[in-house]
C-alpha cells in the first residue's frame, strides 16, 4: 500500500536537486578562487539539514542558521545591486560589471537560484512530486524562507550607495509585496547606507515617460526617506544600450542619456 503523501499546489523539488546543489557549489568555488577552501559536501549537509524531515509549511529562519554561517562571504558592501521582477537584466549587468553583485552572485544565492525544494515531516525523503505554493498553501515553506533569510542578510550587509533595478513595464514598478519591497527595503541599515538609487528599466522602445515620477516609486521614496536613507532614481530608457555602454563606456554614443 503506497504511503499517503501530502499533495501541495506548487511544483515539486527540482529533479536531481542534491546533485545540482553540490555541482553548483563546486563550480562556484572554481569560478571564485577566494572560496576555494569551501567544503561543498558540508554545505550540502547544512542545506539538507534545513528542510529534510521537517514539515514544509513549518520552516523557520532558524532552520537555515547553520547554512547561514557560511554566508559571511565578503561581498564589497558598497557594490550591491538589488533587483525586483527584472532578474535577467540584473544578472546580465553584473556579468559585465564584475565588481557589482546581486544576491545570486554570492554562493548561497548561486546554489538556490531557480530551484525548488521541500521535504516531508518525519521522513528523510525529498518531495519531488509537489511543494507548498506561497499563496495557495503556506508562506513558511523551505524556498520562501530561504530567500527571505538570505535577502535579509544581503540587505543588512549593504553600505554606502545601494542600487536597485526595477521593472518599468509592470503595473507596480515598486511592489511592497516583492522580496525587495517586503524584506530588503526594511533591512537596509541607515547607519551604513547613505543612498538607495533606483534604476527604472523601460520596456518599450518609444517609452520616454519619466517613470521616476510613478506613484509606486514615490511610495518607495517615502519609505526610504522615513528610514533616514537618501533616495535617487534614474530612468534606463534603453536597457540594451545601457548594457552595451557598461561593456564599452568609452563609446561616443554613451555620453547621452541611455
Amino acid at each position: 500500500v503506497p504511503r499517503w503523501r501530502q499533495q501541495w499546489s506548487g511544483p515539486g523539488t527540482t529533479k536531481r536537486f542534491p546533485e545540482t546543489v553540490l555541482a553548483r557549489c563546486v563550480k562556484y568555488t572554481e569560478i571564485h578562487p577566494e572560496m576555494r577552501h569551501v567544503d561543498c559536501q558540508s554545505v550540502w549537509d547544512a542545506f539538507k539539514g534545513a528542510f529534510i524531515s521537517k514539515h514544509p509549511c513549518n520552516i523557520t529562519e532558524e532552520d537555515y542558521q547553520p547554512l547561514m554561517k557560511l554566508g559571511t562571504q565578503t561581498v564589497p558592501c558598497n557594490k550591491i545591486l538589488l533587483w525586483s521582477r527584472i532578474k535577467d537584466l540584473a544578472h546580465q549587468f553584473t556579468q559585465v560589471q564584475r565588481d557589482m553583485f546581486t544576491l545570486e552572485d554570492t554562493l548561497l544565492g548561486y546554489l538556490a537560484d531557480d530551484l525548488t525544494w521541500c521535504g516531508e515531516f518525519n521522513t528523510s525523503k525529498i518531495n519531488y512530486q509537489s511543494c507548498p505554493d506561497w499563496r495557495k498553501d503556506c508562506s513558511n515553506n523551505p524556498v520562501s524562507v530561504f530567500w527571505k533569510t538570505v535577502s535579509r542578510r544581503f540587505a543588512e550587509a549593504a553600505c554606502d550607495v545601494v542600487h536597485v533595478m526595477l521593472n518599468g513595464s509592470r503595473s507596480k514598478i515598486f511592489d511592497k509585496n516583492s522580496t525587495f519591497g517586503s524584506v530588503e527595503v526594511h533591512n537596509l541599515q541607515p547607519e551604513k547606507v547613505q543612498t538607495l538609487e533606483a534604476w527604472v528599466i523601460h520596456g518599450g522602445r518609444e517609452d520616454s515617460r519619466d517613470l521616476c515620477q510613478d506613484p509606486t516609486i514615490k511610495e518607495l521614496e517615502s519609505i526610504i526617506s522615513k528610514r533616514n536613507i537618501q533616495f535617487s532614481c534614474k530612468n534606463i530608457y534603453r536597457p540594451d544600450k545601457f548594457l552595451q555602454c557598461v561593456k564599452n563606456p568609452e563609446d561616443s554614443s554613451c555620453t547621452s542619456e541611455i
Epitope: P33, R36, D39, S42, K69, L70, Q73, T74
Partner: antibody
Framework: QVQLVESGGGLVKPGGSLRLSCAAS????????MSWIRQAPGKGLEWVAS????????YYADSVRGRFTISRDNAKNSLYLQMNSLRAEDTAVYYC???????????WGQGTLVTVSS | QSALTQPPSASGTSGQRVTISCSGS????????VYWYQHLPGTAPKLLIY???QRPSGVPDRFSGSKSGNSASLAISGLRSEDEADYYC???????????FGSGTKVTVLG
C-alpha cells in the same frame, strides 16, 4: 621541481622594519595564491598573510594587519613581505608557501629567521 | 590560544595506529576543507592531507584523514620511527578571513 627560497631575515630592533623575499621557480608563479606562514621559537605554525593571483587581493592575520604588507611581482617570480613596526613577538622563522587549488599549502620554502630584539 | 584544538602529544609503539583529533567550529572546519601538515624540526613543513581526506602523491597510505561536523582527525597506521614529528591541522576561518592552524601534536614512537 618547485623551489621556494626565502631571504631577507635577520636581527632588527623593536619598531624597525624588514623586507622578506621569496624567489619561486618550477611552476607558473602568476597562477597561484601565495602565503607567508611563521613559527615562533617553541611555538606552533601561524598563518601570516596570503595574496591572490590575478588582480591581487590580500589577506592578513589580525596579529599583523596594518603593520605587514604582502605583495608579489609576477614578472620576477617573487613574493614579498614588508614588515614594519616590528615587535618581539614577531620573532619567528618565516616560511613562504604556494597554495593549491583547494587552499592547501602544497610547497614550502626552508624558511628565514627574523629576530626582533633590542 | 589556537582556533583549532589539538592534543599536545600522542604516542604509540612501532606498527601501532595513532589518531590525532582537531576540533574547531562552523566558521572553520564546519564549512571548509581541513589540511594536515607534518613538521620535522629544522625542515620545511610538508602537506600530508588536503580536502579532508586526500593524500598528495608521495604520501604513504598509512596516513588518512577524516572530517565530521566541526571536527577532523588524522590517523597514522603502522607507525614508524620516521613518523616522529609535529602534526598540524589547518583550515580557513570565515570569521577571521584567514587560515587557522591547530596548536600542533607531537607524535612520539615508543620503543
Amino acid at each position: 621541481q618547485v623551489q621556494l627560497v626565502e631571504s631577507g631575515g635577520g636581527l632588527v630592533k623593536p619598531g624597525g622594519s624588514l623586507r622578506l623575499s621569496c624567489a619561486a621557480s618550477g611552476f607558473t608563479f602568476s597562477d597561484d595564491y601565495m602565503s607567508w606562514i611563521r613559527q615562533a621559537p617553541g611555538k606552533g605554525l601561524e598563518w601570516v598573510a596570503s595574496v591572490s593571483n590575478g588582480r591581487p587581493t590580500t589577506y592578513y592575520a589580525d596579529s599583523v594587519r596594518g603593520r605587514f604588507t604582502i605583495s608579489r611581482d609576477n614578472a620576477k617570480n617573487s613574493l614579498y613581505l614588508q614588515m614594519n613596526s616590528l615587535r618581539a613577538e614577531d620573532t619567528a622563522v618565516y616560511y613562504c608557501a604556494r597554495e593549491g587549488w583547494s587552499g592547501e599549502f602544497t610547497d614550502w620554502g626552508q624558511g628565514t629567521l627574523v629576530t626582533v630584539s633590542s | 590560544q589556537s582556533a583549532l584544538t589539538q592534543p599536545p602529544s600522542a604516542s604509540g609503539t612501532s606498527g601501532q595506529r595513532v589518531t590525532i583529533s582537531c576540533s574547531g567550529s562552523s566558521s572553520n572546519i564546519g564549512f571548509h576543507f581541513v589540511y594536515w601538515y607534518q613538521h620535522l624540526p629544522g625542515t620545511a613543513p610538508k602537506l600530508l592531507i588536503y580536502k579532508n581526506n586526500q593524500r598528495p602523491s608521495g604520501v604513504p597510505d598509512r596516513f588518512s584523514g577524516s572530517k565530521s561536523g566541526n571536527s577532523a582527525s588524522l590517523a597514522i597506521s603502522g607507525l614508524r620511527s620516521e613518523d616522529e614529528a609535529d602534526y598540524y591541522c589547518a583550515a580557513w576561518d570565515d570569521s577571521l578571513s584567514g587560515y587557522v592552524f591547530g596548536s600542533g601534536t607531537k607524535v612520539t614512537v615508543l620503543g
